[in-house]
Interface confidence: low
């Protein structure tokens, strides 16, 4: 229904905790560089006019959009275009080119230093002197480097934050506590931040019906009792959800999104048996636990697959009728059987299957053309199985870090024109699937470790479309979502590939890499790692192993001397020689 | 387990009208696939309209398309079959079938519907 005041209406949903931390998400998202003060200043005024607006609807600009209340407020911000550059080129135009504009300009690798987290007893005084500003700062500091993350998802990890710290900070050994239950929080919130990016890149490139294809496919296998019409109607306020979210519409997003969340708490008896848990919590964890509920147990009546789509002599006559239901239906039947496919894969046999109608519904005898399609499919489901079974192997035998290295001298052998640091944050990226997913029951494997990397590979890709230099990566960005993953796994070494001088300065260390943490050492160790193969695309595993273990064990005599500068300053050219004599 | 129970049938003139009902009683009718199927003395069981589980997307054998309506009141959990100007060639027992699991496509496939109704007679007959 049409509301008088669009804000006023969104501010009365929401409630003004909630409106607040999603307006500051919104203006953080988009103003990437403004500090936590000046987005907390325009929140401030943006929940002050929302109140005049709750409290007489007809008051003066109650009854403008959203975009032009937000866009208003960030292009009257001083210094636009000191600070932003052609940014403020869209202050020039009107909605809803302007807020477009505003979108074309969110940046998925912003120059801002990585987020820190201050030290235990530190975090406890600000936290427990003003818990508002606290939180405010961890939505700004997130929103900011993540401009597409999921915003009420966002609220609910804020929440998740908010409930350690109030734990932890009355403990005695705070440390002990914060860290890994803050790491966790960390490690769930980057993971939702790629899926939530590869949502948006499906809606960006291939739009709304691509999304809800992707939507159809995952809510058949969590919810395989749910009829067509119940997974149909999920999926299309599903991908209104994200479409939202994805296009800057926040507070619409999380309204709806809400609606969604009741909408299945009280149609269980139709939607599956699992819910339960979920929808007996508050809003933000409900809608969380509903979007990773476990899969309902299947039907056990289900008909074999091959009765209506391969064996019916009308499929055909089916399939013209209503192409997007006959093919909708066909990916919601096999989705709900294969509850251990990834959606990737899943689609891609739906493609696969639309494909062979195409072709066989034009020819002279169609049954006969079509009839073997499913034993079609079998190469397609081979290949990630395989994908799946060596790389968990791999990853038994060498561990998460030996893991990351395996994958960094593959990913930069088929791509070394791509950035050492876009290499070493893919090839740590994409090492975390071992631990993520090879752990899992044998049924999990596959959906686990083929999202994660599709998802991991999307950001690949957006950090090259900003500046292309390997013809291998464009090729295989190009092309759709769901194949992209195979694409990369079928590259092999760039043959086209002139390798890089080898530089001493590049493989020289100093004494400040002893104090390093952990996760950073790592970091310069792979670094140097990326920078081998570039030097030497086809140097041996044999090869690089010597090197990288000559360089561990120098690190490691060199960070126990007693006078380490003089160590790395003798040391460090001899590695150099021996890098250079064992890779020759 | 789905009970259905047929009625409506009876003599008819050529050109004539009849409207078939199809009670469904152990699971509601939106959820299952469910059409008609008929039976000429002698002849093999045929398809003669569907409607699919939860989308109201029909079907229909092409000797009866155009004369034939499928539909179902969810209220009242039964399915119809409106059948105008019959022909002599449509005297048959017309049985109606439903598939559980919800599908959205209504098979042809007689073979593929678990339940079903003990038949109601159609004479089409000067």
């Known amino acids: 229904e049409a509301h008088k005041s669009e804000i006023a209406h969104r501010y009365n949903d929401l409630g003004e905790q909630h409106f607040k931390g999603l307006v500051l998400i919104a203006f953080s998202q988009y103003l990437q560089k403004c500090s936590y003060d000046e987005h907390a200043k325009l929140v401030q005024e943006v929940t002050d006019f929302a109140k005049t607006c709750v409290a007489d609807e007809s008051a003066a600009n109650c009854d403008k959009s959203l975009h032009t209340l937000f866009g208003d407020k960030l292009c009257a911000i001083p210094n636009l275009r000191e600070n932003y550059g052609e940014l403020a080129d869209c202050c020039t135009k009107q909605e809803p080119e302007r807020n477009e504009c505003f979108l074309q300009h969110k940046d998925d690798n912003p120059s801002l230093p990585p987020f820190e987290r201050p030290e235990a007893e530190a975090m406890c005084t600000s936290f427990k002197e003003n818990p508002t500003t606290f939180m405010g700062h961890y939505l700004h500091e997130v929103a900011r480097r993540h401009p597409y993350f999921y915003a009420p998802e966002l609220l609910y990890y804020a929440e998740q934050y908010n409930e350690i710290l109030t734990q932890c900070c009355a403990e005695a050994d705070k440390e002990s506590c914060l860290t890994p239950k803050l790491d966790g929080v960390k490690e769930k919130a980057l993971v939702s931040s790629v899926r939530q990016r590869m949502k948006c890149s499906s809606m960006q490139k291939f739009g709304e019906r691509a999304f809800k294809a992707w939507a159809v496919a995952r809510l058949s296998q969590t919810f395989p009792n749910a009829d067509f019409a119940e997974i149909t109607k999920l999926a299309t306020d599903l991908t209104k959800v994200n479409k939202e979210c994805c296009h800057g519409d926040l507070l619409e997003c999380a309204d709806d999104r809400a609606e969604l969340a009741k909408y299945m708490c009280e149609n269980q008896a139709t939607i599956s048996s699992k819910l339960q848990t979920c929808c007996d919590k508050p809003l933000l964890k409900k809608a969380h636990c509903l979007s990773e509920v476990e899969h309902d147990t299947m039907p056990a009546d289900l008909p074999a697959i091959a009765a209506d789509f391969v064996e019916d002599q009308e499929v055909c006559k089916n399939y013209a009728e209503a192409k997007d239901v006959f093919l909708g239906t066909f990916l919601y039947e096999y989705s709900r059987r294969h509850p251990d496919y990834s959606v990737s894969l899943l689609l891609r046999l739906a493609k696969k299957y639309e494909a062979t109608l195409e072709k066989c519904c034009a020819e002279a005898n169609p049954p006969a053309c079509y009839g073997t399609v499913l034993a079609e499919f079998q190469p397609l489901v081979e290949e990630p199985k395989n994908l799946v079974k060596t790389n968990c192997d791999l990853y038994e035998k060498l561990g998460e870090y030996g893991f990351q290295n395996a994958i960094l001298v593959r990913y930069t052998q088929k791509a070394p024109q791509v950035s050492t640091p876009t290499l070493v944050e893919a090839a740590r990226n994409l090492g975390r699937v071992g631990t993520k997913c090879c752990t899992l029951p044998e049924d999990q494997r596959l959906p686990c470790v083929e999202d994660y990397l599709s998802a991991i590979l999307n950001r690949v890709c957006l950090l090259h479309e900003k500046t292309p230099v390997s013809e291998h990566v464009t090729k295989c960005c190009s092309g759709s979502l769901v194949e992209r993953r195979p694409c990369f796994s079928a590259l092999t070494v760039d043959e086209t590939y002139v390798p890089k001088e080898f530089k001493a300065e590049t493989f020289t260390f100093h004494s400040d890499i002893c104090t390093l943490p952990e996760k950073e050492k790592q970091i310069k160790k792979q670094t140097a790692l990326a920078e081998l193969v570039k030097h030497k695309p086809k140097a041996t595993a044999e090869q690089l192993k010597t090197v990288m273990d000559d360089f561990a064990q120098f690190l490691d005599t060199c960070c126990k001397a007693a006078d380490k500068d003089t160590c790395f300053s003798t040391e460090g050219p001899n590695l150099v020689t021996r890098c250079k004599d064992a890779l020759a | 387990e789905v009970q259905l129970l047929e009625s409506g049938g009876g003599l008819v003139q050529p050109g004539g009208s009849l409207r078939l009902s199809c009670a469904a009683s152990?699971?509601?009718?939106?959820?299952?696939?469910v059409a008609w199927f008929r039976q000429a003395p002698g002849k093999e069981r045929e398809f003669v309209a569907g409607?699919?589980?939860?989308?109201?997307?029909?079907y229909y054998a092409d000797s009866v398309k155009g004369r034939f309506t499928i539909s179902r009141d969810n209220s009242k959990n039964t399915l119809y079959l409106q059948m105008n100007s019959l022909r002599p060639e449509d005297t048959a027992v017309y049985y109606c079938?439903?598939?559980?699991?919800?599908?959205?496509?209504?098979?042809?496939?007689?073979?593929?519907?678990?339940?079903w109704g003990q038949g109601t007679l159609v004479t089409v007959s000067s």
């Open positions: 079938a439903a598939r559980p699991g919800k599908p959205l496509i209504t098979s042809k496939v007689a073979d593929l519907y678990p339940y």
């Open positions: 152990g699971r509601y009718i939106d959820e299952t696939a």
């Open positions: 409607i699919g589980g939860g989308v109201d997307i029909t």
